[in-house]
Interface confidence: low
């Protein structure tokens, strides 16, 4: 018969014949022959292969380097890579999370709209009228100005986006 030019799914073409690919978690030791099946071996510890393959070497699990601010989010198996994430207070610089950078703080006059996660930075927003933030923080939202009226006081000093209002006693004198 004619040698095959294409093979079925989970097979590969070699020496004019179709051989079985190795399953995820295993690497190729030797190709099949007319008389023998493909020979595969499991990946070693700290190694993986995540597809049906003909690789002769397994891939090393990703190392979550603490010097780059990384820690293990999910331990790798023979079929999956280790997933890294960033330490508290840091976020990934890319989707692959190969390194981390410090979460930004929102300056006075700005509050946290969205707290940073392991993959996204802090989102800041300017404090609108009636709100203030007097600190540089990665967590604090804009706080509403104190309501002097509810304390039976009057505004002695107006608030800004960085400072609260200052309340004081009402003038009791009548004209």
């Amino acid at each position: 018969p004619e040698p095959p030019t294409a093979c079925r799914e989970k097979q590969y073409l070699i020496n004019s014949q179709c051989c079985s690919l190795c399953q995820p978690g295993q690497k190729l030791v030797s190709d099949c022959t007319e008389f023998t099946e493909t020979e595969c071996l499991p990946c070693g510890e700290s190694e993986f292969l995540d597809t049906w393959n003909r690789e002769t070497h397994c891939h090393q699990h990703k190392y979550c380097d603490p010097n780059l601010g990384l820690r293990v989010q999910q331990k790798g198996t023979s079929e999956t890579d280790t997933i890294c994430t960033c330490e508290e207070g840091w976020h990934c610089t890319s989707e692959a999370c190969e390194s981390c950078v410090l979460h930004r703080s929102c300056s006075p006059g700005f509050g946290v709209k969205q707290i940073a996660t392991g993959v996204s930075d802090t989102i800041c927003e300017p404090c609108p009228v009636g709100f203030f933030s007097n600190v540089s923080s990665a967590f604090e939202k804009c706080h509403p100005w104190t309501s002097c009226e509810t304390k039976d006081l009057v505004v002695q000093q107006a608030g800004t986006n960085k400072t609260d209002v200052v309340c004081g006693p009402q003038d009791r004198l009548r004209a």
Epitope: L70, C100, F139
Partner: antibody
């Protein structure tokens, strides 16, 4: 090994601009912020700002805002710092320095580029 | 801007003897994640600065263990347990928590 190689010395007239380059090798260029620090003759160190080559974000020292522009060319792993409207007190050695990520300190420095501003 | 003040300005030392440099910041350098973003650099004569200590106490790769950093909040110290001739140069403290990042004025260490 990590290496930062800077362009050669420059002599400029007041009011002119200078563009210093810093070619990085030995690491993934887009993974680390590049900083620029200058040192006037006989003086201490002054941080000018930094750039994240991955996103292109810049962080400038207010003192240089409007006069400095930091850029990168990821295809050649090169960072650039341009300083405009030069004055005599801009005469200094300009260093590029990589920001070590979890270190959050400047872990590798270029050899420095001397910029002399004189009429 | 955060002001970093170093003392002394000049430090004559005897090889084999200990040495200590102080650094004070005008604001706390402690981040909400618990880390203190205070670093020490050494600039040897005619060379670029080099990182010695990062985040208060951590020695950078290849830095001898005779160098140590300590302190908290706003007061910091770099100690050299036994000074060697190769340790001469200008030592700078620096902060990287508040933009603009700033450096101390430097302490010149020289052999007596």
């Amino acid at each position: 090994q990590v290496q930062l190689v800077q362009s050669g010395a420059e002599v400029k007239k007041p009011g002119a601009s200078v563009k210093v380059s810093c070619k990085a090798s030995g690491y993934t260029f887009t993974g680390y912020n590049m900083n620029w620090v200058r040192q006037a003759p006989g003086q201490g160190l002054e941080w000018m700002g930094n750039i994240d080559p991955y996103y292109g974000n810049t962080n400038y020292n207010q003192k240089f805002k409007g006069r400095v522009t930091m850029t990168t060319d990821t295809s050649t792993s090169t960072a650039y710092m341009e300083l405009r409207s030069l004055r005599s007190d801009d005469t200094a050695v300009y260093y590029c320095a990589r920001l070590g990520l979890q270190l959050y300190a400047l872990d590798y420095w270029g050899q420095g580029t001397t910029v002399t501003v004189s009429s | 801007d955060i002001v970093m003040t170093q003392t002394p300005l000049s430090l004559p030392v005897t090889p084999g003897e200990p040495a200590s440099i102080s650094c004070r910041s005008s604001q706390s350098l402690v981040h909400s994640n618990g880390n203190t973003y205070l670093h020490w650099y050494l600039q040897k004569p005619g060379q670029s600065p080099q990182l010695l200590i990062y985040k208060l106490t951590n020695r950078f790769f290849g830095v001898p263990d005779r160098f140590s950093g300590s302190g908290s909040g706003t007061d910091f110290t770099l100690k050299i347990s036994r000074v060697e001739a190769e340790d001469v140069g200008v030592y700078y403290c620096s902060q990287s928590i508040h933009v603009p990042w700033t450096f101390g004025g430097g302490t010149k260490v020289e052999i007596k």
